[in-house]
């Protein structure tokens, strides 16, 4: 008996971190549910979260198979219980995501310091080499897997007793910094891709300082 | 498939500027590093530099810093290099390469540019 | 700079294996030189064998395989066939910058 108003999706936003990536939209869906469709440029569409009164979904499985692909999503709307049920013109309404390209965009997650060790007068401080849901031969690839000499780490440290801080970059995950006999350090890092115009760090990673138990100490 | 169109060869004279293309068909532009590679006789290959077309960022040689300048369209899919103030020495055949290291390097045919 | 040395010629047979190095002047080679591994043939014709110290790119046949070797980066060709003569370039990354060796010249005969 004609068509049930239903209302298009907006505002469809990528959230998208180490390439875990969700679509999310407006609005919460009343008397009305949503399928997801996700295509790349030149590919087919692919339907996603069939009928769902989600108002996000999770598109990682797609994205994660080429992530240098540029993507774009759409969302449809259905009446709920009734979805045959067609917009005026005939089809389902829907409104298109902006294009999303994984590689270039994905945020960088927070990373974590793995270890520090120092010797005499030298420091080596080791970022941990995160697991990303890319795959490749049936294997997980690591953030540097994937980014390879595209990221890089900054490393900022401090003795505990001043607040000045020193930098110090590389573009391995490892640090070998200088540091002055019988004082200890504060640490923290950030994943950077310098390349990139939008999201080109990560947030810092916790601190760590010599004396807690995540370090080793050697005087040689 | 992946595929790199350079512009064809040039004949210029000294202190003059050129810029050759390279058009990209088959994958994502935006999203690899376009490669610049010159090649004389005798001298193996050179790095020039590179670009990314997607945010335009760009790493030089220091020896073709002021020389060489990289510009990317992605409404084209054509990456570009301009060479300014040329001299004998910058006669050479000039490569762009896209690069990836998982998916190989795909090279263009070159462009050959002579200064006379 | 630093500077990329390789075999400047190399010569095997049919069916033999061969390994051709990539050694870099400011010390010992790791994976963070992202080692690249490039084919040329007559006329201008490049083609990516290995990238990032030993990955094959997509339709290069299996018998070349990329490695560290001591200090040196290597790429092995395992039973040498005659179409595998050509010039084989190195280039090694340095933090902002790749830096191409001089090229091995191949023979297969």
């Known amino acids: 008996s004609g068509t049930t108003n239903t209302v298009a999706a907006y505002n469809l936003t990528w959230k998208s971190t180490n390439f875990k990536t969700i679509l999310e939209w407006e609005p919460k869906p009343v008397n009305q549910v949503y399928t997801v469709q996700i295509s790349t440029k030149s590919g087919d569409w692919k339907s996603k979260c069939f009928y769902t009164t989600d108002t996000e979904c999770d598109l990682t499985d797609e994205i994660v198979k080429d992530v240098k692909q540029t993507y774009l999503a759409r969302v449809f709307s259905y009446p709920a219980g009734n979805v045959e049920s067609t917009g005026s013109a005939g089809e389902p309404l829907y409104e298109n995501s902006p294009e999303f390209t994984p590689y270039l965009e994905t945020n960088l997650g927070q990373p974590t310091i793995q270890s520090f060790e120092q010797v005499g007068t030298k420091v080596n401080v080791t970022v941990e080499d995160e697991r990303t849901l890319v795959r490749r031969n049936n294997t997980f690839l690591s953030l540097r897997d994937v980014f390879g000499k595209d990221l890089i780490y900054t490393l900022y440290y401090w003795k505990s007793s001043s607040s000045g801080k020193k930098t110090a970059k590389t573009n391995t995950n490892e640090f070998l910094i200088d540091v002055d006999k019988g004082e200890n350090y504060c640490f923290s890092v950030q994943a950077v891709i310098p390349s990139r115009t939008v999201n080109r760090k990560s947030t810092d990673s916790p601190v760590e300082c010599m004396g807690q138990e995540k370090g080793e100490f050697r005087e040689i | 498939q992946v595929q790199l169109k350079q512009s064809g060869a040039e004949l210029m004279k000294p202190g003059a500027s050129v810029k050759i293309s390279c058009k990209a068909t088959g994958y994502t532009f935006s999203s690899y590093w376009i490669e610049w590679v010159k090649q004389r006789p005798g001298h193996g290959l050179e790095w020039i530099g590179e670009?990314?077309?997607?945010?335009?960022?760009?790493n030089y040689n220091e020896k073709f810093k002021g020389k060489a300048t990289f510009t990317a369209d992605t409404s084209s899919n054509t990456a570009y290099m301009q060479l300014s103030s040329l001299t004998s020495e910058d006669s050479a055949v000039y490569y762009c390469?896209?690069?990836?290291?998982?998916?190989?390097?795909?090279w263009g045919q070159g462009t050959t540019l002579t200064v006379s | 700079q630093a500077v990329v040395t390789q075999e400047s010629a190399l010569t095997t047979s049919p069916g033999e294996t061969v390994t051709l190095t990539c050694r870099s002047s400011t010390g010992a080679v790791t994976t963070s030189n992202y080692a690249n591994w490039v084919q040329e043939k007559p006329d201008h014709l490049f083609t990516g064998l290995i990238g990032g110290t030993n990955n094959r790119a997509p339709g290069v046949p299996a018998r070349f395989s990329g490695s560290l070797i001591g200090d040196k980066a290597a790429l092995t060709i395992t039973g040498a066939q005659t179409e595998d003569e050509a010039i084989y370039f190195c280039a090694l990354w340095y933090s902002n910058h790749w830096v191409f060796g001089g090229g091995t010249k191949l023979t297969v005969l």
């Open positions: 670009i990314l077309p997607g945010s335009g960022s760009t």
């Open positions: 390469a896209r690069e990836d290291r998982y998916d190989g390097d795909y």
